[in-house]
């Protein structure tokens, strides 16, 4: 039961995490205008991975896509790539893990195959989560660097009475969504890997016991499941005799636009 719960929970946590990674990737608020220096601005700027937006105090919001590929900073391209890789790996992981779930019976799929698939999906979730966390962290680092650069340049080069306040950007909501989502996907992946260990049938090495019946010399070897060595299904290991000693899990498995800062 504990293994099924761990696997199920790992799947759900990963599902939420990947949904969060997708949401973060699509969100426009990766960086938002820092209002500390100009809290009275009537125009609010924010930027995403795919477009930049301006919300006027009237409520009117205008967004412009980054219609150039070569003109964008390499770091932004890298973040996009990391997030997309994270989504793709996560999606494949989800697909694999659905078939690996113990509560879902597909044909005569053996536990060893399910364990194999659970481990595969778990690794995919871990890599997916790491990609998202890395992508968000790279973007955050880029923001911090640009923030201090623009702070240093804020009032330089302007003589006289005129002030030119350079727009500075700080962390947007998408960064926090991305970090949390990446973390959840990572945790879900770890849980899947832990569940995989419980799913893999263990080698049961029973000692051969010789029973000497009067007049006969018969050696009876209890076999139970002749366990395969791990994750590949071994077709030679036929079920000879069900020894009755099963885990709770086995009993419970029923069928069921531009400038970029």
């Amino acid at each position: 039961m504990a293994v099924t719960a761990c696997q199920g929970l790992g799947f759900v946590v990963s599902l939420i995490g990947i949904a969060g990674i997708i949401a973060a990737t699509c969100m426009d608020q990766w960086s938002t205008q820092d209002l500390y220096n100009n809290p009275v601005t009537a125009v609010f700027n924010y930027q995403g991975l795919w477009r930049s937006c301006v919300r006027e105090s009237s409520g009117f919001t205008e967004c412009r896509g980054y219609f150039t590929l070569l003109g964008l900073p390499a770091m932004l391209q890298a973040v996009r790539a990391l997030m997309i890789v994270g989504i793709v790996l996560g999606a494949i992981g989800l697909l694999v893990s659905i078939f690996a779930l113990k509560c879902i019976r597909i044909g005569s799929m053996e536990d060893s195959a399910k364990a194999n698939m659970t481990l595969t999906s778990g690794i995919m979730f871990i890599v997916s989560g790491l990609c998202a966390i890395a992508g968000v962290s790279v973007f955050a680092n880029m923001l911090v660097t640009n923030f201090w650069m623009s702070t240093a340049n804020m009032y330089t080069g302007m003589g006289g009475m005129v002030q030119t306040v350079q727009t500075r950007y700080t962390f947007g909501a998408a960064l926090f969504v991305g970090w949390v989502a990446g973390g959840l996907t990572l945790i879900g992946g770890v849980m899947m890997c832990i569940a995989c260990r419980g799913l893999a049938p263990e080698e049961t090495n029973y000692k051969a016991v010789s029973y000497h019946a009067s007049g006969h010399s018969v050696a009876y070897k209890p076999g139970g499941f002749k366990a395969s060595t791990g994750f590949g299904s071994n077709t030679k290991n036929k079920k000879i005799y069900d020894g009755g000693a099963r885990t709770e899990d086995e009993v419970q498995s029923y069928p069921s636009k531009h400038d970029y800062v």
Epitope: Q33, N38, V40, T41, A42, V43, N45, Y46, Q47, S52, C53, V54, E56, S57, S58, G59, F60, E62, R64, V162, Q163, T164, V165, Q166, T167, K257, D259, V261
Partner: antibody, heavy 119, light 113 residues
Amino acid sequence: QVQLVQSGAEVKKPGASVKLSCKASGYTFTSYWMHWVRQRPGQGLEWIGMIHPNSGSTNYNEKFKSKATLTVDKSTSTAYMELSSLRSEDTAVYYCARRYYGSISPDYWGQGTTVTVSS
Amino acid sequence: DIQMTQSPSSLSASVGDRVTMTCKSSQSLLNSGNQKNYLTWYQQKPGKAPKLLIYWASTRESGVPSRFSGSGSGTDFTLTISSLQPEDFATYYCQNDYSYPFTFGGGTKLEIK
């Protein structure tokens, strides 16, 4: 068509209060910010503040924060501005103006209400 | 608060003339996010409410004749009337639309010569 009809002229004594109204028609009242602007005799325009009828959220010019109170009545599509502790320098024409959607600028203005403060 | 300074304060011209008036702001009204200048021009005739002419420094409001044009960026802006018509004699105000409180210039009064 869009119309903003303001209440009639008011004559008040110093220290009194006055509540000006601006009735909107011809558009969805709750979708646009309503601005209030003051113009003293022979002077320029001064922005008092604005209110969003849907949320009741306001933004005041610091200069008028203790002078003006902006409110709305969604049921009658009417915006109000109450001016308190009136003084002779509050004698002016007060305009309400609808927020322009697509730009920050108001695009429809009321005809104005003249407030005279005299002892 | 952003200070808006208009010049000249009054201007005499004849019908058919090309007229230019300027507006200076104490801070840049250029928004880096969309490269738009948040400056608006209004026309006001005696006893009437102001009328929106131009927003975003150069975008003409619908229904405004093409003889009115706005230009400039950052802190320096210009309103040009290419060929004055009798109905254009009025007071023109520029307004900061970038930062609260929204501030107006002192106005330029356009009179008949």
